[in-house]
Amino acid sequence: FGISGRHSITVTTVASAGNIGEDGILSCTFEPDIKLSDIVIQWLKEGVLGLVHEFKEGKDELSEQDEMFRGRTAVFADQVIVGNASLRLKNVQLTDAGTYKCYIITSKGKGNANLEYKTGAFSMPEVNVDYNASSETLRCEAPRWFPQPTVVWASQVDQGANFSEVSNTSFELNSENVTMKVVSVLYNVTINNTYSCMIENDIAKATGDIKVTESEIKRRSHLQLLNSKA
């Protein structure tokens, strides 16, 4: 009997974000069939005429693939049998942002789920003591961000304090004319304190911590993607 007579199957996606110029993952899972021959995976993008990717009969079928995705997509072929339909997207572009559909057909039926994919640039900040400055100064640098983020300083000792008056942030366009280098300087730093440099845009939030004591300096960094139901 045809597809119309089959049941629907559950397909699950996770909203995610891609870092421009790097490889990204569009996550999609489904209850797998035991046999590979009956599994078809189609990835589609809203507003794009051709397919983003198609996998059927155990291999890629790219004859209908849209030009903008040519040579940039792959499924994890060895994991399809266990229900992983996730798509690897190489060299993420700003224009890859949008709504994607993961469409699955198995012997049991068909199902689909949408996924919101954001693109931008985000990187881990590094906080260092700026020994070139005339006073005790911290310098927070992150090489790649887009869209332009906000930068906020915080301190463990002076919780809730506003450091905007004693900090200076600049954004320098990188050579590819999209992403920017973020540099923020914090003045009048006291020792025996932990300072945090927090960089955030609508895609990611990153924090660089530095603990300054008389005997040592300790650093820690953390990056979190926003609006991703991880």
Epitope: I9, E31, P32, D33, I34, K35, L36, S37, D38, E57, G58, K59, A77, D78, Q79, I81, V82, G83, T106, S107, K108
Partner: antibody, heavy 116, light 107 residues
């Protein structure tokens, strides 16, 4: 440690029934499909039946269709094989195996002997 | 049904030898082929999946290749613990089918 442990094998007369169990531990059982595979004495491996993670897909070898039933209880992390109308040619070591790309985890096997 | 024809059915070799076992599917199974090692009285052990991906913990002397209908398992330098029976299996379509096995014996 990821483990599968079969039980329920034994000696049974032709036409009789047995229920094999496979207890899983060390992994999220409800996320994986499972297989039963058997091996007759001195012979090769023969696939018997498969069941997907949520029991949505069930398949049988022609040689056991209508006589064997594969099932699972995800709350108990256990796979079952109900074997009815047993024949002499069903005599074998029965293995349960986890479904992945191939069968990546196997139990130690349980012996079923069908004889009068 | 897809038949998996394995050859040779038995093979004598010495420690240090390079050994090749082949498996031919009666129709295309893409790359949905696995290889197993089985020792007497023991359960099979997965060596290779997706035709060429080595399972975690499997020594690098084991390698797999092929796509479509023709597949190969190669052991680059036989070790004493490698003497066993080897099976190929397709998981492209049901019924899932195994090759008849290749018994690798000490020469």
């Amino acid at each position: 440690e990821v483990q599968l442990l079969e039980s329920g094998g034994g000696l049974v007369q032709p036409g009789g029934s047995l229920r094999l169990s496979c207890a899983a531990s060390g992994f999220t059982f409800s996320s994986y499909g499972m297989h039963w595979v058997r091996q007759a004495p001195g012979k090769g491996l023969e696939w018997v039946a498969s069941i997907s993670s949520s029991s949505g897909y069930i398949y049988y070898a022609d040689s056991v269709k209508g006589r064997f039933t594969i099932s699972r209880d995800n709350s108990k992390n256990t796979l079952y094989l109900q074997m009815n109308s047993l024949r002499a040619e069903d005599t074998a070591v029965y293995y349960c195996a986890r479904a992945s790309s191939g069968m990546d985890v196997w139990g130690q096997g349980t012996t079923v002997t069908v004889s009068s | 049904d897809i038949q998996m024809t394995q050859s040779p059915s038995s093979l004598s070799a010495s420690v240090g030898d390079r050994v090749t076992i082949t498996c031919r599917a009666s129709q295309s199974v893409s790359s949905a082929v696995a290889w197993y090692q089985q020792k007497p009285g023991k359960a099979p052990k997965l060596l290779i999946y997706a035709a060429s991906i080595r399972e975690s913990g499997v020594p690098s002397r084991f390698s797999g290749s092929g796509s479509g209908t023709d597949f190969t398992l190669t052991i680059s330098s036989l070790q004493p613990e490698d003497f066993a029976t080897y099976y190929c299996q397709q998981y492209y379509s049901t019924p899932l089918t195994f090759g008849q096995g290749t018994k690798l014996e000490i020469k």
